[in-house]
Amino acid sequence: MGRARDAILDALENLSGDELKKFKMKLLTVQLREGYGRIPRGALLQMDAIDLTDKLVSYYLESYGLELTMTVLRDMGLQELAEQLQTTKEESGAVAAAASVPAQSTARTGHFVDQHRQALIARVTEVDGVLDALHGSVLTEGQYQAVRAETTSQDKMRKLFSFVPSWNLTCKDSLLQALKEIHPYLVMDLEQS
């Protein structure tokens, strides 16, 4: 955490006044992932690089904020800056992946959440409790509402998992912790399977 934020800030501080203005304009029209809201135009246009970085992280969290910044920079033709962010993203991903592999097991890779995606979609019934545990710290208000709007537990879990690709290790650990609190026997069962 924090590394992606610093990388976004570095990139934005490298932009000229006109480029920063163009970045903001593109941010107003860029295609957003489902469940994410747009930063209000009025506030956005007045922001300097520091404020904009804070807003990007606050609205989209670090991982997706980084990705979105890369997308806009590429769209502006600033490939070199985008590549620098790509490096940060890959390094963060490598750290997260390395940290999530249990030391005693090389046969299995990936986080519990990724390993047991299908089982969790099928078997988690108390989804609202899980959502409440993730609200704000992992899920934005928009994402939270988007998941809760689904009608069945399975659809809610599918929607929740649609956001997982942009999560870092901390976010996945938060989901696992919530599952341990709300569905302890399910987690124990899956850990032993």
């Epitope: 955490m1 609202d128 409790g129 710290s137």
Partner: antibody, heavy 118, light 111 residues
Framework: EVQLQQSGAELVRPGSSVKMSCRTS????????ITWVKQRPGQGLEWIGY????????EYNEKFKDKATLTSDTASSTVYMQLNSLTSEDSAIYFC???????????WAQGTTLTVSS | DIVLTQSPASLAVSLGQRATISCRAS??????????MHWYQQKPGQPPKLLIH???NLESGVPARFSGSGSGTDFTLNIHPVEEEDAATYYC?????????FGGGTKLEIK
């Protein structure tokens, strides 16, 4: 023991800004959100917004979007609320409170009284 | 915004009797699992205090004479038997969607 402690009363001029603080202790600061609530003398409660400290994620009541800015400092386990372009309508007690699971407000600070007067 | 209408605005109840406060939401604040409605007590010069979270869950340290019920749009706070120290203003609050809103309050007086 969970505790929230707010900064002291403020008397400010119309048109100016003020920044009040809410210092927390007794729990892992980054795990919860902090909400701010406004109460005018003899009136009800109005929800201003919240900040999740771990990631700086904020949401505001549309009514306060141009009035309030929430920030946090993890090193001192403190959340701040800045109010700008103050008018007499902003004179009130402002409370910070911890967001619990389900977003109930389980611990409250004592409140900061803001008086806007020329 | 979801509007929460509390009734009555004030009530006077004799010591040992039951006080019933109602809170009606302008739209449902319940999912299949939870009702996102909470109840607070506020005494003069003090911050509000959480009594009940998620419609019916008593906060730890709150006397068992307080109870909450309801789902969808209609919620109730009951106090029985009422004690002297219960004289206060009571507020309901939802956390279903932004902005979270509070009811207008109900002032309870002990006769």
């Amino acid at each position: 023991e969970v505790q929230l402690q707010q900064s002291g009363a403020e008397l400010v001029r119309p048109g100016s800004s003020v920044k009040m603080s809410c210092r927390t202790s007794g729990y892992t600061f980054t795990n919860n959100g902090i909400t701010w609530v406004k109460q005018r003398p003899g009136q009800g409660l109005e929800w201003i917004g919240y900040i999740y400290v771990g990631n700086g994620y904020t949401e505001y009541n549309e009514k306060f979007k141009d009035k309030a800015t929430l920030t946090s400092d993890t090193a001192s386990s403190t959340v701040y609320m800045q109010l700008n372009s103050l008018t007499s309508e902003d004179s009130a007690i402002y409370f910070c409170a911890r967001l619990d699971r389900g977003r109930a407000l389980d611990y409250w600070a004592q409140g900061t009284t803001l008086t806007v007067s020329s | 915004d979801i509007v929460l209408t509390q009734s009555p605005a004030s009530l006077a109840v004799s010591l040992g009797q039951r006080a019933t406060i109602s809170c009606r939401a302008s739209k449902s604040v319940s999912s299949s699992a939870y009702s996102y409605m909470h109840w607070y007590q506020q005494k003069p010069g003090q911050p509000p205090k959480l009594l009940i979270h998620l419609a019916s869950n008593l906060e730890s340290g709150v006397p068992a004479r307080f109870s909450g019920s309801g789902s969808g749009t209609d919620f109730t706070l009951n106090i029985h038997p009422v004690e002297e120290e219960d004289a206060a203003t009571y507020y309901c609050q939802h956390s279903w969607e932004l902005p979270y809103t509070f009811g207008g309050g109900t002032k309870l007086e002990i006769k």
